[in-house]
Interface confidence: low
Protein backbone atom coordinates (compact mmCIF):
# COMPACT_ATOMS: atom_id res chain seq x y z
CA UNK A 1 0.00 0.00 0.00
CA UNK A 2 1.11 3.55 -0.65
CA UNK A 3 2.97 5.24 2.20
CA UNK A 4 4.53 8.03 0.16
CA UNK A 5 1.43 10.25 0.09
CA UNK A 6 2.37 13.82 1.07
CA UNK A 7 2.16 14.58 4.76
CA UNK A 8 2.52 18.28 4.00
CA UNK A 9 0.72 20.63 6.41
CA UNK A 10 -2.53 21.56 4.60
CA UNK A 11 -2.17 25.06 6.02
CA UNK A 12 0.87 25.68 3.85
CA UNK A 13 -1.50 26.04 0.89
CA UNK A 14 -3.23 29.05 2.42
CA UNK A 15 -2.00 32.20 0.65
CA UNK A 16 -1.30 35.59 2.18
CA UNK A 17 -4.57 37.32 2.95
CA UNK A 18 -6.05 34.16 4.44
CA UNK A 19 -5.61 32.03 7.53
CA UNK A 20 -5.84 28.31 8.13
CA UNK A 21 -9.09 27.94 10.04
CA UNK A 22 -8.94 25.02 12.48
CA UNK A 23 -12.62 25.55 13.26
CA UNK A 24 -13.48 24.82 9.65
CA UNK A 25 -11.42 21.71 8.96
CA UNK A 26 -8.27 23.68 8.11
CA UNK A 27 -9.99 25.50 5.26
CA UNK A 28 -8.26 28.69 4.15
CA UNK A 29 -10.54 31.52 5.27
CA UNK A 30 -10.18 35.15 4.21
CA UNK A 31 -8.79 37.49 6.85
CA UNK A 32 -11.71 39.18 8.60
CA UNK A 33 -12.17 42.96 8.53
CA UNK A 34 -9.34 44.95 10.10
CA UNK A 35 -6.88 42.06 9.94
CA UNK A 36 -4.23 40.81 7.54
CA UNK A 37 -1.72 38.04 6.91
CA UNK A 38 1.38 39.05 5.00
CA UNK A 39 2.63 35.49 4.45
CA UNK A 40 1.04 32.19 3.52
CA UNK A 41 0.36 29.33 5.89
CA UNK A 42 -0.67 31.46 8.84
CA UNK A 43 -3.09 30.11 11.43
CA UNK A 44 -4.33 33.54 12.41
CA UNK A 45 -4.56 36.97 10.82
CA UNK A 46 -2.90 39.91 12.56
CA UNK A 47 -4.99 42.87 13.66
CA UNK A 48 -4.50 45.92 11.44
CA UNK A 49 -2.81 48.92 12.97
CA UNK A 50 -5.33 51.68 13.70
CA UNK A 51 -4.12 55.19 12.91
CA UNK A 52 -6.02 57.21 15.49
CA UNK A 53 -5.65 60.48 17.32
CA UNK A 54 -2.49 62.25 16.29
CA UNK A 55 -1.75 59.45 13.80
CA UNK A 56 -3.36 59.48 10.36
CA UNK A 57 -3.56 56.75 7.75
CA UNK A 58 -0.86 56.92 5.08
CA UNK A 59 -1.70 53.52 3.60
CA UNK A 60 -4.89 51.55 4.20
CA UNK A 61 -4.66 48.07 5.68
CA UNK A 62 -5.17 45.39 3.04
CA UNK A 63 -5.68 41.71 3.65
CA UNK A 64 -1.98 41.13 2.94
CA UNK A 65 -0.33 44.19 4.49
CA UNK A 66 -0.69 46.29 7.60
CA UNK A 67 -1.84 49.89 7.61
CA UNK A 68 0.88 52.54 7.69
CA UNK A 69 0.50 55.71 9.70
CA UNK A 70 2.04 59.13 9.60
CA UNK A 71 1.32 62.15 11.78
CA UNK A 72 -1.28 64.87 11.52
CA UNK A 73 -0.07 68.36 10.55
CA UNK A 74 1.92 69.92 13.36
CA UNK A 75 3.54 66.62 14.29
CA UNK A 76 6.26 64.42 12.80
CA UNK A 77 7.12 60.72 13.01
CA UNK A 78 9.63 59.19 15.37
CA UNK A 79 10.72 55.59 15.70
CA UNK A 80 10.52 52.61 13.39
CA UNK A 81 7.35 52.58 11.33
CA UNK A 82 6.28 55.92 12.82
CA UNK A 83 5.67 54.44 16.26
CA UNK A 84 5.40 57.90 17.82
CA UNK A 85 4.35 61.38 16.78
CA UNK A 86 6.27 64.31 18.19
CA UNK A 87 5.09 67.91 18.14
CA UNK A 88 6.64 70.19 15.53
CA UNK A 89 8.26 73.43 16.64
CA UNK A 90 9.02 76.47 14.52
CA UNK A 91 12.39 76.92 12.92
CA UNK A 92 14.58 78.55 15.53
CA UNK A 93 13.09 76.43 18.31
CA UNK A 94 13.57 73.04 19.92
CA UNK A 95 11.14 70.80 21.78
CA UNK A 96 11.72 70.55 25.52
CA UNK A 97 9.71 68.96 28.31
CA UNK A 98 8.03 72.31 28.73
CA UNK A 99 7.17 72.67 25.05
CA UNK A 100 8.81 74.59 22.22
CA UNK A 101 11.60 76.97 23.33
CA UNK A 102 13.65 79.40 21.27
CA UNK A 103 17.21 78.41 20.51
CA UNK A 104 19.73 79.96 22.87
CA UNK A 105 22.12 82.58 21.47
CA UNK A 106 24.85 80.87 19.52
CA UNK A 107 22.64 77.98 18.40
CA UNK A 108 20.18 77.45 15.55
CA UNK A 109 17.62 75.00 14.18
CA UNK A 110 16.57 75.23 10.53
CA UNK A 111 13.96 72.46 10.85
CA UNK A 112 10.64 71.96 12.65
CA UNK A 113 12.10 69.04 14.58
CA UNK A 114 15.29 68.19 16.40
CA UNK A 115 17.49 70.22 18.68
CA UNK A 116 19.26 73.53 18.39
CA UNK A 117 22.86 73.13 17.21
CA UNK A 118 25.81 75.47 17.72
CA UNK A 119 26.73 77.87 14.96
CA UNK A 120 29.75 76.84 12.94
CA UNK A 121 32.97 78.21 14.43
CA UNK A 122 34.49 79.82 11.35
CA UNK A 123 37.80 80.53 13.08
CA UNK A 124 38.48 76.81 13.47
CA UNK A 125 38.89 76.71 9.68
CA UNK A 126 40.85 79.93 9.66
CA UNK A 127 37.88 81.74 8.18
CA UNK A 128 35.88 84.74 9.22
CA UNK A 129 32.13 85.23 9.70
CA UNK A 130 30.64 86.61 6.50
CA UNK A 131 26.98 86.44 7.54
CA UNK A 132 25.93 86.32 11.16
CA UNK A 133 23.94 83.37 12.44
CA UNK A 134 20.37 83.55 13.69
CA UNK A 135 18.10 81.21 15.62
CA UNK A 136 16.99 79.76 12.28
CA UNK A 137 20.20 79.84 10.26
CA UNK A 138 23.84 78.95 10.74
CA UNK A 139 26.55 81.52 10.19
CA UNK A 140 28.08 81.80 6.75
CA UNK A 141 31.83 81.62 6.87
CA UNK A 142 33.75 83.96 4.56
CA UNK A 143 37.27 83.77 3.27
CA UNK A 144 40.31 84.22 5.42
CA UNK A 145 42.54 87.17 4.43
CA UNK A 146 44.91 84.72 2.72
CA UNK A 147 42.09 83.55 0.42
CA UNK A 148 41.57 87.01 -1.03
CA UNK A 149 43.77 86.35 -4.03
CA UNK A 150 42.62 86.32 -7.67
CA UNK A 151 40.53 83.22 -8.54
CA UNK A 152 39.81 82.27 -4.97
CA UNK A 153 36.27 81.34 -4.00
CA UNK A 154 34.75 84.18 -2.07
CA UNK A 155 32.23 82.29 0.05
CA UNK A 156 32.44 78.83 1.58
CA UNK A 157 29.11 77.84 3.09
CA UNK A 158 29.41 75.42 5.98
CA UNK A 159 28.45 71.79 5.44
CA UNK A 160 24.81 71.43 6.47
CA UNK A 161 24.47 69.91 9.91
CA UNK A 162 21.57 67.46 9.93
CA UNK A 163 20.27 65.17 12.59
CA UNK A 164 21.03 61.56 11.68
CA UNK A 165 18.06 59.76 10.23
CA UNK A 166 16.02 62.88 9.57
CA UNK A 167 15.46 64.61 6.28
CA UNK A 168 14.40 68.25 6.24
CA UNK A 169 10.65 68.79 6.46
Amino acid sequence: FERTRSLQDPCSNCPAGTFCDNNRNQICSPCPPNSFSSAGGQRTCDICRQCKGVFRTRKECSSTSNAECDCTPGFHCLGAGCSMCEQDCKQGQELTKKGCKDCCFGTFNDQKRGICRPWTNCSLDGKSVLVNGTKERDVVCGPSPADLSPGASSVTPPAPAREPGHSPQ
Epitope: G17, S29, P30, P32, P33, N34, S62, S63, T64
Partner: antibody, heavy 120, light 111 residues
Protein backbone atom coordinates in the same frame (compact mmCIF):
# COMPACT_ATOMS: atom_id res chain seq x y z
CA UNK B 1 -36.46 30.91 7.31
CA UNK B 2 -33.57 33.35 6.85
CA UNK B 3 -34.79 36.86 6.08
CA UNK B 4 -33.23 40.29 5.71
CA UNK B 5 -35.80 43.07 5.69
CA UNK B 6 -34.64 46.55 4.74
CA UNK B 7 -36.11 49.98 5.43
CA UNK B 8 -38.17 51.84 2.84
CA UNK B 9 -37.18 54.08 -0.05
CA UNK B 10 -35.60 57.46 0.70
CA UNK B 11 -35.34 60.75 -1.19
CA UNK B 12 -32.50 63.01 -0.08
CA UNK B 13 -30.96 66.30 -1.12
CA UNK B 14 -27.28 66.57 -2.12
CA UNK B 15 -25.06 66.97 0.93
CA UNK B 16 -27.48 65.18 3.24
CA UNK B 17 -27.03 61.77 4.88
CA UNK B 18 -29.10 58.61 4.65
CA UNK B 19 -29.32 55.71 7.10
CA UNK B 20 -30.61 52.38 5.80
CA UNK B 21 -31.55 49.56 8.17
CA UNK B 22 -31.49 45.81 7.63
CA UNK B 23 -33.30 43.59 10.14
CA UNK B 24 -32.19 39.95 10.23
CA UNK B 25 -34.24 36.95 11.33
CA UNK B 26 -34.14 33.17 11.04
CA UNK B 27 -30.49 32.73 12.06
CA UNK B 28 -28.00 33.62 14.80
CA UNK B 29 -27.39 37.27 13.99
CA UNK B 30 -23.92 37.50 15.54
CA UNK B 31 -22.56 34.44 13.72
CA UNK B 32 -22.64 35.90 10.22
CA UNK B 33 -21.05 38.99 8.73
CA UNK B 34 -23.24 41.44 6.83
CA UNK B 35 -22.18 42.97 3.51
CA UNK B 36 -23.57 46.16 1.95
CA UNK B 37 -23.73 46.33 -1.84
CA UNK B 38 -25.25 49.03 -4.02
CA UNK B 39 -26.51 49.15 -7.59
CA UNK B 40 -27.01 52.39 -9.49
CA UNK B 41 -29.86 52.41 -12.05
CA UNK B 42 -28.91 50.27 -15.05
CA UNK B 43 -25.45 49.61 -13.56
CA UNK B 44 -23.64 46.72 -11.93
CA UNK B 45 -23.16 45.72 -8.30
CA UNK B 46 -20.67 47.63 -6.15
CA UNK B 47 -19.35 46.36 -2.81
CA UNK B 48 -19.41 49.02 -0.10
CA UNK B 49 -18.26 47.27 3.03
CA UNK B 50 -18.86 44.64 5.68
CA UNK B 51 -19.63 44.54 9.38
CA UNK B 52 -19.12 41.80 11.95
CA UNK B 53 -22.32 41.93 14.03
CA UNK B 54 -20.58 40.15 16.88
CA UNK B 55 -17.85 42.67 17.66
CA UNK B 56 -18.94 45.51 15.40
CA UNK B 57 -15.69 45.62 13.43
CA UNK B 58 -16.00 46.95 9.90
CA UNK B 59 -14.10 47.03 6.62
CA UNK B 60 -15.08 49.59 3.99
CA UNK B 61 -14.30 49.81 0.29
CA UNK B 62 -11.68 52.49 -0.27
CA UNK B 63 -14.09 54.49 -2.42
CA UNK B 64 -16.43 55.01 0.54
CA UNK B 65 -13.88 55.51 3.31
CA UNK B 66 -14.82 58.56 5.37
CA UNK B 67 -18.39 58.70 4.01
CA UNK B 68 -19.86 55.40 5.11
CA UNK B 69 -20.52 54.10 8.61
CA UNK B 70 -21.84 50.63 9.35
CA UNK B 71 -23.23 49.84 12.79
CA UNK B 72 -25.36 47.15 14.39
CA UNK B 73 -27.83 46.70 17.22
CA UNK B 74 -27.62 43.16 18.54
CA UNK B 75 -30.75 43.61 20.69
CA UNK B 76 -32.86 43.99 17.54
CA UNK B 77 -30.66 41.97 15.14
CA UNK B 78 -30.39 45.02 12.90
CA UNK B 79 -27.47 46.42 10.94
CA UNK B 80 -27.34 49.99 9.68
CA UNK B 81 -25.51 51.66 6.82
CA UNK B 82 -25.18 55.45 6.91
CA UNK B 83 -23.82 57.32 3.88
CA UNK B 84 -23.04 61.01 4.27
CA UNK B 85 -22.33 63.93 1.93
CA UNK B 86 -24.71 62.47 -0.63
CA UNK B 87 -24.37 63.38 -4.30
CA UNK B 88 -26.47 62.52 -7.33
CA UNK B 89 -24.15 59.59 -8.20
CA UNK B 90 -25.22 57.93 -4.92
CA UNK B 91 -28.70 57.36 -6.35
CA UNK B 92 -28.94 53.56 -6.21
CA UNK B 93 -30.58 50.52 -4.70
CA UNK B 94 -28.72 49.58 -1.51
CA UNK B 95 -28.67 45.92 -0.51
CA UNK B 96 -27.63 44.23 2.70
CA UNK B 97 -26.51 40.62 2.32
CA UNK B 98 -25.53 37.92 4.78
CA UNK B 99 -22.00 36.66 4.41
CA UNK B 100 -22.19 32.91 3.95
CA UNK B 101 -20.90 31.10 7.06
CA UNK B 102 -18.62 33.22 9.21
CA UNK B 103 -16.48 35.42 6.96
CA UNK B 104 -16.94 33.26 3.90
CA UNK B 105 -16.46 34.43 0.39
CA UNK B 106 -20.02 34.96 -0.74
CA UNK B 107 -23.41 36.34 0.25
CA UNK B 108 -26.07 33.68 0.48
CA UNK B 109 -29.11 35.75 1.51
CA UNK B 110 -29.95 39.29 0.38
CA UNK B 111 -32.37 41.96 1.53
CA UNK B 112 -35.00 43.25 -0.87
CA UNK B 113 -33.06 46.46 -1.44
CA UNK B 114 -33.65 50.09 -0.49
CA UNK B 115 -33.94 52.72 -3.22
CA UNK B 116 -32.14 55.94 -2.30
CA UNK B 117 -32.70 58.88 -4.63
CA UNK B 118 -30.46 61.94 -4.34
CA UNK B 119 -31.98 64.93 -6.06
CA UNK B 120 -32.11 68.67 -5.55
CA UNK C 1 -14.80 50.60 -14.59
CA UNK C 2 -15.30 47.35 -12.68
CA UNK C 3 -12.41 45.53 -11.05
CA UNK C 4 -13.34 42.25 -12.76
CA UNK C 5 -14.01 42.04 -16.50
CA UNK C 6 -17.05 40.23 -17.89
CA UNK C 7 -18.53 40.24 -21.39
CA UNK C 8 -21.45 42.64 -21.59
CA UNK C 9 -23.76 40.04 -23.10
CA UNK C 10 -24.01 36.42 -24.18
CA UNK C 11 -26.86 34.53 -25.77
CA UNK C 12 -27.88 30.97 -26.46
CA UNK C 13 -30.83 28.86 -27.52
CA UNK C 14 -32.80 26.64 -25.16
CA UNK C 15 -30.94 23.39 -24.47
CA UNK C 16 -27.55 24.85 -25.43
CA UNK C 17 -24.62 25.52 -23.09
CA UNK C 18 -23.04 28.93 -22.58
CA UNK C 19 -19.99 30.10 -20.63
CA UNK C 20 -19.48 33.51 -19.03
CA UNK C 21 -15.92 34.56 -18.24
CA UNK C 22 -14.70 36.77 -15.41
CA UNK C 23 -11.14 38.05 -15.68
CA UNK C 24 -9.22 39.58 -12.80
CA UNK C 25 -5.65 39.64 -11.56
CA UNK C 26 -3.39 37.65 -9.27
CA UNK C 27 -4.60 39.91 -6.43
CA UNK C 28 -8.16 38.68 -6.72
CA UNK C 29 -9.41 35.86 -8.99
CA UNK C 30 -5.98 34.33 -9.52
CA UNK C 31 -4.84 34.62 -5.93
CA UNK C 32 -7.78 33.13 -4.06
CA UNK C 33 -10.40 30.44 -4.53
CA UNK C 34 -13.09 32.88 -3.44
CA UNK C 35 -15.01 33.54 -6.64
CA UNK C 36 -18.81 33.72 -6.47
CA UNK C 37 -21.48 34.03 -9.15
CA UNK C 38 -24.82 35.77 -8.72
CA UNK C 39 -27.96 35.73 -10.86
CA UNK C 40 -30.16 38.82 -10.91
CA UNK C 41 -33.55 39.09 -12.58
CA UNK C 42 -34.86 42.61 -13.33
CA UNK C 43 -36.11 44.40 -10.21
CA UNK C 44 -34.99 41.57 -7.93
CA UNK C 45 -32.13 41.08 -5.47
CA UNK C 46 -29.15 38.99 -6.61
CA UNK C 47 -29.17 35.26 -5.91
CA UNK C 48 -26.06 33.23 -5.10
CA UNK C 49 -25.46 30.53 -7.74
CA UNK C 50 -21.84 29.48 -7.19
CA UNK C 51 -19.41 30.13 -4.32
CA UNK C 52 -15.73 29.38 -3.75
CA UNK C 53 -15.17 28.94 -7.53
CA UNK C 54 -17.18 25.76 -8.08
CA UNK C 55 -19.51 25.04 -5.16
CA UNK C 56 -23.27 25.13 -5.61
CA UNK C 57 -25.54 26.19 -2.73
CA UNK C 58 -28.39 23.79 -1.99
CA UNK C 59 -31.38 24.47 -4.19
CA UNK C 60 -29.33 25.65 -7.20
CA UNK C 61 -29.68 23.49 -10.30
CA UNK C 62 -26.72 21.30 -11.26
CA UNK C 63 -26.94 22.87 -14.71
CA UNK C 64 -24.85 25.68 -13.20
CA UNK C 65 -21.14 25.02 -12.72
CA UNK C 66 -18.07 27.12 -12.03
CA UNK C 67 -14.36 26.78 -12.69
CA UNK C 68 -11.17 28.81 -12.69
CA UNK C 69 -7.93 28.89 -14.64
CA UNK C 70 -5.26 31.41 -13.74
CA UNK C 71 -6.79 34.86 -13.41
CA UNK C 72 -10.03 33.92 -15.17
CA UNK C 73 -13.11 32.32 -13.64
CA UNK C 74 -15.98 30.91 -15.67
CA UNK C 75 -19.65 30.15 -15.14
CA UNK C 76 -21.15 27.50 -17.40
CA UNK C 77 -24.89 27.00 -17.77
CA UNK C 78 -25.87 23.82 -19.59
CA UNK C 79 -29.30 22.97 -20.97
CA UNK C 80 -30.32 26.62 -21.18
CA UNK C 81 -33.87 27.38 -20.09
CA UNK C 82 -35.98 30.52 -20.56
CA UNK C 83 -35.86 31.29 -16.83
CA UNK C 84 -32.04 31.50 -16.99
CA UNK C 85 -32.38 34.82 -18.83
CA UNK C 86 -30.97 37.33 -16.35
CA UNK C 87 -27.88 39.35 -15.45
CA UNK C 88 -24.94 37.41 -14.02
CA UNK C 89 -22.25 38.91 -11.82
CA UNK C 90 -18.97 37.43 -10.67
CA UNK C 91 -17.40 38.49 -7.40
CA UNK C 92 -14.02 37.83 -5.84
CA UNK C 93 -12.18 38.42 -2.61
CA UNK C 94 -9.21 40.71 -3.18
CA UNK C 95 -6.04 41.45 -1.26
CA UNK C 96 -6.58 45.19 -1.67
CA UNK C 97 -8.10 47.29 1.11
CA UNK C 98 -11.39 46.94 -0.76
CA UNK C 99 -11.93 43.34 0.31
CA UNK C 100 -14.54 42.29 -2.29
CA UNK C 101 -14.96 43.23 -5.94
CA UNK C 102 -17.62 42.57 -8.57
CA UNK C 103 -17.52 42.21 -12.30
CA UNK C 104 -19.50 44.57 -14.50
CA UNK C 105 -22.19 41.98 -15.15
CA UNK C 106 -23.22 39.92 -18.18
CA UNK C 107 -26.72 39.97 -19.68
CA UNK C 108 -27.74 36.46 -20.73
CA UNK C 109 -30.38 36.27 -23.44
CA UNK C 110 -32.12 32.97 -24.17
CA UNK C 111 -33.13 33.13 -27.81
Amino acid sequence: EVQLVQSGAEVKKPGASVKVSCKASGYTFTSYYTHWVRQAPGQGLEWMGIINPSGGSTSYAQKFQGRVTMTRDTSTSTVYMELSSLRSEDTAVYYCARGAPEYSSSSDYWGQGTMVTVSS
Amino acid sequence: QSALTQPASVSGSPGQSITISCTGTSSDVGGYNYVSWYQQHPGKAPKLMIYDVSNRPSGVSNRFSGSKSGNTASLTISGLQAEDEADYYCSSYTSSSTRWVFGGGTKLTVL
